[in-house]
Amino acid sequence: LGCDLPQTHSLSNRRTLMIMAQMGRISPFSCLKDRHDFGFPQEEFDGNQFQKAQAISVLHEMIQQTFNLFSTKDSSATWDETLLDKFYTELYQQLNDLEACMMQEVGVEDTPLMNVDSILTVRKYFQRITLYLTEKKYSPCAWEVVRAEIMRSFSLSANLQERLRRKE
C-alpha cells in the first residue's frame, strides 16, 4: 500500500524551507523581545503511534493550516508576492501528494483516517499562532516570529515524513 510520497514530498518540503528562509525581511535579532513559545506539538509528529493514514492526516493538517495562515489579507500585505506565490505552490503540491497518498492508502478499507485528538492538538497550535498575531496587531516582528516558528515546525515534521517513507 505504498504511495509515491517519498521523492516528490521531501523535495517540496526542502523547497518550502528555502522559500521561507528567503521570505525573512528583518533581522530576527531586532525581534527578540517578541519571541514566543507556541508549544509545537512534537509528540504528534514523532510517528511512533501512527498508522500511515493517521500520519498523512496530521501532516496534511499542518500544511493546510500553514496555507490558511499565509493566505490571509494580512499575510499578503506583509510578504513579497513572488515568494508568497512560490510558497503557495509548494504547499499545494504537498497537499496534493498527501491527498493522492491517502486515496491509495484507505482504498475501500475502513482504515481509521485520523486520531481526532492529534488533529485538534495541531489546530490548537495554529490557533495560538493566530491569536499571537492578532494580539501583536500583525506587526512585522510578529510575522517574523511566526515565519521562524513555521520553519521550525516544518523541520521537525520531517521526522514523521521520514517514517512515512519507510512504513509500508
Epitope: 496534511h60 493546510q64 496555507f67 493566505s71 504547499l91 499545494y92 475501500v108 483516517l113
Partner: antibody, heavy 126, light 110 residues
C-alpha cells in the same frame, strides 16, 4: 461561517457566453477551492469545475472542457464562471460552493461542499 | 469515472416513519469520500453527512450515514415535517479532483 453571494439571473442566446460571479465573505481562505455546480430544472446536481484562488489553479469536469473558464480574485475573494457556446440544455441554476475549514480532518475538507451560494439562474433562449 | 445510482427515486412516507436511502457506486469508494446533502424546493443544497458517517454542524442525530465499498445508506430514524426534501449522495476522487453526484432520492409526504 462562509457566505457566498452570486450575481443575478441572466437570459442568453444560444451560442453566446455567460459570466457568473460568486463573492465570498466571512471566514474565507484563498487556500480552499471554490467549485461551480449546476442544476438544470427538475434535475440533479452536476459538478463543473473548481479553482484554488490563492494560485489560480483550475480543474474542470470532462463534460465542460473547452467551454468553461473559472477565474478568481483574491481580494475581495471572488470566483467567476464563464461558459461559452451556450446551448438550450445549459439552462440551469448555477451554484458556487466551498469547503469548510472546520471539517476534521482537513484532508476531508476539500472533498465536499459545506457552503453554497443562493444560485444564479441562467436561461438560454432564442 | 464513478457513477452513483440512488434508489428509490421517490420515497412516500409519513412523519414519524423511518427512511433508508441507498447510494450505489459503480466501483469501490472509500466511505471517507462519501457525502450526503439535503435540498428543499427553491433552496441551495445543505451538507448533511461527510466521511460516510460524520454529521455536519447542526444536523440532528436522527440522520445517520453508513455503508462501505459500493453500497452506502442514509438513514432518517423518525421523519420530521422539515425533513421532506431531495437527498443527494456525492463521492470524491483524486487526482485529478472529480466530484460525482447521484441523481437524488425524493422523500415526499404520503
Amino acid at each position: 461561517e462562509v457566505q457566498l453571494l452570486e450575481s443575478g439571473a441572466e437570459v442568453k442566446r444560444p451560442g453566446s457566453s455567460v459570466r457568473v460571479s460568486c463573492r465570498a465573505s466571512g471566514d474565507t481562505f484563498s487556500s480552499y477551492p471554490i467549485s461551480w455546480v449546476r442544476q438544470a430544472p427538475g434535475q440533479g446536481l452536476e459538478w463543473m469545475g473548481r479553482i484554488l484562488p490563492a494560485l489560480g489553479v483550475t480543474n474542470y469536469a470532462q463534460n465542460f472542457r473547452g467551454r468553461i473558464t473559472i477565474t478568481a480574485d483574491k481580494s475581495p475573494l471572488t470566483a467567476y464562471l464563464e461558459l461559452s457556446s451556450l446551448r438550450f440544455e445549459d439552462t440551469a441554476v448555477y451554484y458556487c460552493a466551498s469547503p469548510s475549514a472546520d471539517i476534521i480532518p482537513s484532508i476531508l475538507g476539500t472533498t465536499l461542499f459545506a457552503f453554497w451560494g443562493q444560485g444564479s439562474l441562467v436561461t438560454v433562449s432564442s | 469515472e464513478i457513477v452513483l445510482t440512488q434508489s428509490p427515486g421517490t420515497l412516500s412516507l409519513s412523519p414519524g416513519e423511518g427512511a433508508t436511502l441507498s447510494c450505489r457506486a459503480s466501483q469501490n469508494v472509500s466511505r471517507h469520500y462519501l457525502t450526503w446533502y439535503q435540498q428543499k424546493p427553491g433552496q441551495s443544497p445543505r451538507l448533511l453527512i461527510y466521511g460516510g458517517s460524520s454529521r455536519a454542524t447542526g444536523v440532528p442525530d436522527r440522520f445517520s450515514g453508513g455503508g462501505s465499498g459500493t453500497d452506502f445508506t442514509l438513514t432518517i430514524s423518525r421523519l420530521e415535517p422539515e425533513d421532506f426534501a431531495v437527498f443527494y449522495c456525492q463521492s470524491y476522487h483524486s487526482p485529478p479532483p472529480v466530484y460525482t453526484f447521484g441523481q437524488g432520492t425524493k422523500v415526499e409526504i404520503k
